[in-house]
């Protein structure tokens, strides 16, 4: 089944987002954290910036790295874009050293790499030739990762982009990819990391990079451009082979990843973004990836894990694919059946290896070399964690993926997925036993631009998401348990980092808040029993002429509730021509009279676990009156009357607590009755805690309160 | 063993169009880049553009652009160059071209020589 | 665009002889210690043959009286001892950026 829809929808404006942004600069696309210096590094349009990770609208220090115009104009005639194309668009951003960054940009189509001194904040000059390290055409996809002071990375190594690369930059080894349809089939280069074969780097010869992409599909023919997800792996050890496969990689080989629901012939073969979980409860890494299906008018988008340790086996156990014969070119490519050389072709020189004499890819075999390099592609595919997708969701394009795993209340685990969209906005989606629950969903841009870069910084309490896009950064905490204003709503979130405090009477964030978590309320299932202290209700006064239109209101905010009116204790329906709904959430009463005075109650009914939790959101009391005109008083401030409806119109400000709030005054368009702004919290108190008493040409106001016991 | 054919030779007039053949055999075609080279009399090589016979993805040197169209048809094996709004410059040998692994032409096909007069 | 350019244009040599063609490219066409400059041979009314691929590998079935050297921006092309089937045109080519690029050619006739 597809994933639900985010509980609760966040406005830009409604949350507490910081934003980073300097004005003329562009494409905020390149983001690198450094965590023990409380640093974000920025890699933008022309220049690289550093800002502060606790608040990134702190800027700590930037550095421009700008076109000539002479490079400017040489790249527009070649064909190129002056405005847009024929800039510097930083590209590469990986750490070199504590004191210096590695840094690439497109540099006008001639790419060029520089070491970023991190004390002074300059380049060194260094103008490194950056081809196959950064792609010539900021349009076109790339990746890298810094292991060991080396770059691996993947992009185009040509100006017109046709020649995919994999390669590594190092002074004593480079290596990279064969120019060949069978290795990489125009790619799109998606993600890159390093995975060390033991935590304490005892072993760093064994390590592997794994580099995850997209491309055309060599071994099944079809009408149209097939496209396939990828993973290829090369060993950090490799050396290149002596004469096959001089200065190549001789470890080189990539699977096939499924993401598919093969019960709705549902196939999701884009791959947009991966991120490798590791935590120290995890036996061993794990691969999110953010997939679209390949004609996706629909906005479908999936999510699959992939254990290390399936993606191992395939590359270490599994059958290899060969180029079918000659005069079969529409079989393409078929499973190798016959005998594989020893050493295993693609295999990375282990102390096995080394225990059989073969010290460095250099000694392997001619055999095993032309072997690995006539079959990199392996037949069998790598399959994700229970054979399907963790989340598939309809109406959406997932750009980018972190994940966070977090321990919940009860000392559960739980791995939070964190995903950008082509509109600007962060869903939040915890991975429970049997579902995925979609927490939330926060607008980070308000442009509904697409997120071009997403980082997740992991330091313990201090915990943030960075997204980049187009126009800046937005930096983003990782929940928001405070906007849960009650112990219903702060447990209906089913939110791992949130619980409630009886205490504080306040929804607070796990392993932030200060002092004990005793007595905090969290339910993951969302069973709400434990919220026994009702909050303060109120109610809501209203006085009515006879014939007139009463709008009643009420606040929700889950998406995942409906909203029931009680009259009497009696539901109503809005198939009278009595009542109507306006936004399913507030009341209209048409044609007032007598019969319609009493309790009006707003509730919200939301539907988790098969169970149905019930919540008051609104209490209104309605009398119907017959009123005599009344001189306003000189202390009195009159509504305006529409025709025969009262509007009553609710302050800005709605007032926590048990002051009264201060009376104010709220015109009314002659054409609509407007809604007041949105409640900044979900609403689930009855905010805002006062009562409206309307009379035609009469407003006064006064607040009272319900406790739990009062009759509901 | 491993081949490339060319169409045989073509007289156009100034202004038409003319489509070059190159048919693959011995080898997978799907596997390696298709190049297209051209000579002009007495003149030395130049490169116009290759293909992906995989994807039909084609990308040209910026003086051939608008001038060649490459396609390929996979079922067939054979690769195509055609040329457009014939000029008497554009009269040339034609050569398709295998890019092997190593980057370079280990394989050429005979050449087709189109010659453009009124 | 990387311009080839080779030296002499036309060289007369006696048989058995040894024939040097050079070439020098307009920037590097070196990457990470890998030089992409090939050598055709190219005979009246006949396609290119590759020759040496990668500055000094020797295609295979190519008499080893040819070889190849240089990096960077400079490189050559030796016949050790020059036989009678050897009178051609020879091409070098970049293959390390496009627009791929060849030289003007030499023509290489017998003394």
């Known amino acids: 089944a597809f994933a639900p829809v985010p509980r609760i929808t966040w406005e830009h404006g409604e949350v507490g987002l910081v934003k980073f942004h300097e004005p003329g600069i562009f494409n905020y696309s390149s983001l690198l954290m450094s965590e023990d210096k409380d640093t974000l590094y920025v890699g933008a349009r022309e220049a690289v910036f550093a800002v502060n990770a606790l608040d990134i609208s702190e800027k700590q220090h930037e550095v421009y790295w700008k076109v000539s115009e002479d490079k400017k104009s040489k790249c527009a005639e070649k064909g190129k874009s002056k405005q847009t194309e024929c800039l510097n668009y930083i590209r590469v951003l990986q750490p070199l050293s504590s004191t210096s960054l590695y840094v690439c940009g497109t540099n006008a189509f001639q790419p060029t790499c520089d070491h970023l001194n991190l004390t002074s904040f300059k380049f060194l000059g260094k103008s490194e030739d950056g081809k196959g390290r950064c792609p010539f055409d900021p349009a076109h996809s790339y990746t890298s990762v810094m292991v060991g002071g080396e770059l691996y990375s993947g992009t185009s190594y040509n100006f017109l982009g046709s020649e995919p690369i994999i390669s590594r930059n190092s002074s004593h080894s480079p290596l990279r990819t064969e120019y060949a349809i069978p290795w990489l089939n125009e790619p799109s280069f998606v993600f890159a990391d390093v995975i060390h074969k033991s935590p304490d780097g005892t072993e760093a010869e064994d390590d592997k990079v794994y580099f995850f992409f997209t491309e055309v599909s060599v071994e099944y023919e079809f009408v149209f451009k097939l496209m396939i997800p990828r993973v290829a792996r090369v060993c950090k050890g490799d050396q290149g082979g002596l004469r096959t496969l001089q200065k190549k990689w001789t470890s080189f080989l990539k699977a096939r990843l499924i993401c598919s629901r093969p019960d709705s012939g549902l196939v999701f073969n884009i791959l947009q973004d991966v991120f490798v979980l590791r935590a120290p409860g995890l036996k061993e890494p794990v691969f999110y990836a953010v997939f679209t299906p390949q004609l996706n008018n629909v906005g479908l988008s999936a999510v699959c894990a992939y254990t290390l340790s399936t993606v191992e086996a395939v590359f270490s156990r599994g059958k290899y694919m060969q180029s079918a014969t000659v005069e079969q070119s529409h079989t393409k490519w078929v499973r190798y059946n016959g005998p594989v050389p020893t050493p295993r072709p693609g295999a990375c020189i282990d102390s096995e290896a080394r225990a059989a004499n073969y010290t460095s890819s250099l000694n392997l075999p001619d055999k095993t070399l032309q072997f690995v390099k006539d079959h990199p592609l392996m037949d069998d595919s790598v399959t994700p964690i229970d054979n399907r997708p963790k989340l598939i969701k309809k109406d959406v394009n997932y750009t980018q993926i972190v994940v966070d795993r977090t321990q919940a209340l009860d000392g559960t685990f739980y791995d939070v997925m964190f995903l950008s969209t082509d509109r600007g906005a962060l869903h939040k989606a915890v991975i429970l036993a049997k579902e995925v629950h979609v927490v939330e969903e926060t607008q980070l841009f308000q442009d509904f631009e697409p997120v071009l870069s997403l980082l997740l910084s992991s330091k313990k309490g201090r915990k943030f998401v960075y997204a980049g896009s187009n126009s800046g950064v937005v930096q983003a905490p990782l929940a928001f348990c405070g906007k849960h204003s009650s112990c219903e709503d702060c447990v209906l979130a089913r939110d791992p980092y949130c619980a409630w405090s009886p205490a504080i009477k306040a929804c607070v964030t796990l392993h932030q808040a200060e002092g004990s978590s005793r007595g905090w309320i969290q339910d993951m299932s969302g069973d709400t029993s434990s919220c026994l202290d009702k909050s303060k209700e109120s109610f809501h006064q209203h006085f009515f002429k006879h014939g007139g239109t009463a709008e009643l209101k009420c606040f929700q905010k889950s998406n995942l509730a409906r909203v029931v009116w009680k009259f009497q204790n009696g539901e109503l329906k809005a198939v009278s021509p009595k009542y109507g709904f306006v936004g399913r959430k507030h009341l209209l009463i048409f044609n007032l009279s007598d019969g319609d005075s009493g309790v009006y109650q707003c509730l919200s009914e939301e539907r988790v676990r098969n169970k149905t939790v019930s919540q008051l959101l609104a209490k209104h009391i309605l009398e119907v009156k017959m009123v005599a005109r009344i001189p306003p008083s000189p202390t009195s401030q009159t509504a305006q009357t529409e025709g025969s409806r009262i509007t009553s119109k609710m302050p800005v400000a709605s007032t926590q607590g048990s002051s009264p709030p201060t009376p104010a005054l709220w015109a009314t368009s002659p054409r609509a009755a407007t809604l007041p702004p949105k409640s900044s919290s979900t609403g689930t108190s009855c905010e805002p805690k006062m009562v409206i008493n309307t009379v035609p040409q009469l407003h006064s106001e006064k607040t009272v309160y319900l406790k739990s016991s009062d009759n509901r | 063993q491993v081949q490339l054919v060319q169409s045989g030779a073509e007289v156009k007039k100034p202004g038409s169009s003319v489509k070059v053949s190159c048919k693959a055999s011995?080898?997978?075609?799907?596997?390696?880049?298709m190049h297209w080279v051209r000579q002009a009399p007495g003149q030395g090589l130049e490169w116009m553009g290759q293909?992906?016979?995989?994807?039909?993805?084609?990308s040209y040197n910026q003086k051939f652009k608008g001038k060649a169209t490459i396609t390929v048809d996979k079922s067939t094996s054979t690769a195509y160059m055609e040329l457009s709004s014939l000029r008497s410059e554009d009269t040339a040998v034609y050569y398709c071209?295998?890019?092997?692994?190593?980057?370079?032409?280990?394989?050429w096909g005979q050449g087709t020589t189109v010659t453009v007069s009124s | 665009d990387i311009v080839m350019t080779q030296s002499p244009d036309s060289l007369a040599v006696s048989l058995g002889e040894r024939a040097t063609i050079n070439c020098k490219a307009s920037?590097?066409?070196?990457?990470?210690?890998?030089?992409?400059m090939n050598w055709y041979q190219q005979k009246p009314g006949q396609p290119p043959k590759l020759l040496i691929y990668?500055?000094?590998n020797l295609e295979s079935g190519v008499p080893d009286r040819f070889s190849g050297s240089g990096s960077g921006t400079d490189f050559t092309l030796t016949i050790s001892s020059l036989q009678a089937e050897d009178v051609a045109v020879y091409y070098c080519?970049?293959?390390?950026?496009?627009?791929?690029?060849f030289g003007q050619g030499t023509k290489l006739e017998i003394k």
């Open positions: 071209a295998r890019y092997y692994y190593g980057r370079h032409f280990d394989v």
């Open positions: 011995g080898y997978s075609f799907s596997d390696y880049y």
């Open positions: 293909i992906n016979p995989t994807t039909g993805g084609a």
């Open positions: 920037q590097s066409v070196d990457y990470d210690g890998d030089s992409y």
């Open positions: 990668a500055a000094s």
């Open positions: 080519q970049q293959s390390n950026e496009d627009p791929y690029t």
